[in-house]
């Protein structure tokens, strides 16, 4: 199948919230839950998530939150008591109004006409808001992840189904049902379905197999497929890099420790802007390649590249994704030039043979221009250490 | 106590409109939120419409979307619901509501329920 053509994109941060929203059938999600299928219910009003009202919440809703959600239908619907006291009972007759500030700020409400998402409606300032918080637990405790690809939007894709995390089979797989996984965790597109091996195999289960996905749906386990079947083995284990991950390289010095910065974004190499670049992002991108400390950064270059990212970091993230950073899609690095680095495990340093990846870093090459790197749990924590 | 009561109703034919109105004892009208229930011949009392403490939100039953509208006046302590396009399946004694904590859609947050007054689609 062709890729599914990219949305128009904004520019972007990572302070703003998803492309798509989880719930994007429904404005509500689930927060503080064991899973994305169950806990406190939140709705968005404009710009804002802000939790429903408990006072209305009854089991209508509740059912159709969780279809919504593709959890399922609900088990149990239930109020949380709120933060604070509640208000007080009915003012005695005659006492002035205490309406005026207690009503303008009031919870919504998600009012359902029967159990399905179709006949619901958002009601603002439908209760008091220090009310009671409506809560629900769904039957069908679903969830979806991408592991072992560095970063939330590229790995290994796993579902949460009857309590544990198993994988989809690669048989079938590709774009459209990548762009699923993608879109529904807020990865943006797809830029590569990816067949077993290319990231670690998982362990538990095999949930899914002949997945075969529109690309319309929202989420995994609306789209046709098989129960994962026995022969179907972790060797052939799905994977999806999505347009919102970022991998990095350095370009055009001695070796891969050195030279200058580009970040794989949205389904092209950009060049990163010097006029922010500082010793705290060199470290940590030096780090993230497993290439030792940032030594010093050269004077850049005219862009060759499209320049159009910002890092910020304090210099004790893992990767340049998890610093604050800016993505400007109509304008390119406006007076600056692109960023570079040299790492002190640059053999124009030590003048020796390529650096020996750490073993805690696998490397893993996906396509000519693309390159990820995986980390796994156990050798991030021996790294932190 | 808050005091509610219901006036305006009758008899109209089919495809008429009537104005129902309820006004209330309490100087503290604006600290409710209103709303409408019905009961019809032979039937359980179902939610109409409400609307909140200030008058900003409001919320219908999917029978009568398009058709009634409610309406408030604080400064006159009277809840309003004009209802057009009436239908026989519309009979009912309507009752008017007021609830403190929450829009009174569901009968659990209903504080105060006025005496009712019928409405006859014929």
């Known amino acids: 199948h062709p890729s599914p053509a990219p949305p128009d994109q904004l520019n972007t941060s990572s302070a703003e919230s998803e492309l798509w929203e989880p719930g994007e059938r429904l404005p509500v999600r689930l927060t503080n839950g064991s899973s994305s299928c169950s806990g406190t219910v939140e709705v968005r009003l404009e710009a804002s998530w802000e939790p429903a009202c408990g006072a209305l919440w009854d089991s209508r809703a509740a059912e159709a939150v969780c279809r919504a959600l593709g959890c399922g239908g609900a088990e149990a619907a239930s109020q949380l008591a709120p933060p604070t006291p509640e208000l007080p009972p009915p003012p005695a007759a005659g006492n002035t109004s205490v309406a005026a500030n207690a009503t303008l700020a009031g919870a919504p409400a998600l009012l359902c006409s029967g159990a399905e998402w179709r006949l619901c409606e958002v009601v603002e300032h439908a209760c008091r808001s220090d009310g009671r918080r409506a809560r629900v637990t769904c039957a069908e405790n679903r969830a979806l992840r991408l592991v072992d690809g560095g970063g939330a939007c590229a790995g290994r894709v796993e579902m949460l189904e009857h309590g544990e995390w198993g994988s989809v089979c690669d048989d079938t797989w590709d774009l459209e049902d990548a762009h699923v996984v993608c879109r529904q965790l807020g990865c943006g597109w797809a830029v590569q379905a990816l067949p077993g091996l290319h990231f670690t195999p998982g362990r538990g289960p095999i949930h899914r197999d002949q997945v075969n996905c529109s690309g319309a749906e929202a989420y995994l386990w609306d789209c046709p497929g098989l129960p994962g079947q026995h022969y179907c083995g972790h060797k052939e284990d799905a994977g999806a890099v999505c347009s919102e991950h970022q991998s990095w390289r350095l370009t055009g010095g001695a070796d891969r420790c050195e030279g200058q910065v580009e970040v794989h974004f949205r389904g092209v190499w950009n060049t990163v802007c010097d006029s922010e670049w500082y010793p705290s992002e060199a470290k940590v991108l030096c780090q993230s390649l497993g290439c030792g400390t940032a030594v010093e950064r050269p004077k850049g270059l005219p862009h060759s590249l499209s320049g159009r990212m910002y890092y910020s970091c304090n210099g004790e993230e893992l990767t340049l994704s998890n610093c604050s950073w800016r993505f400007n899609n109509s304008n390119l690095c406006s007076q600056s030039l692109a960023a570079r680095v040299l790492c002190s495990a640059s053999r124009s340093l030590h003048n020796l043979s390529t650096p020996e990846v750490p073993a805690s870093v696998q490397t893993v090459t996906i396509e000519s221009s693309v390159t990820v790197k995986i980390e796994n749990k156990e050798s991030r924590e021996l790294m932190l250490l | 106590q808050v005091q509610l009561q219901e006036s305006g109703g009758g008899l109209v034919q089919a495809g008429g409109s009537l104005r129902l109105s309820c006004t209330a004892s309490?100087?503290?009208?604006?600290?409710?939120?209103l709303g409408w229930f019905r009961q019809g011949p032979g039937k359980e009392r179902e939610f109409v419409a409400a609307?909140?403490?200030?008058?900003?939100?409001?919320y219908y039953a999917d029978s009568v979307k398009g058709r009634f509208t409610i309406s408030r006046d604080n400064a006159k302590n009277t809840l309003l619901l004009q209802m057009n396009s009436l239908k026989p399946e519309d009979t009912a004694v309507y009752f008017c509501?007021?609830?403190?904590?929450?829009?009174?859609?569901?009968?659990?947050?209903?504080?105060?329920w006025g005496k009712g007054t019928q409405v006859t689609v014929s």
């Open positions: 509501v007021a609830s403190w904590g929450a829009m009174p859609v569901l009968t659990h947050v209903i504080n105060y």
């Open positions: 309490e100087r503290t009208f604006s600290d409710y939120a």
């Open positions: 609307i909140n403490w200030v008058g900003g939100s409001t």
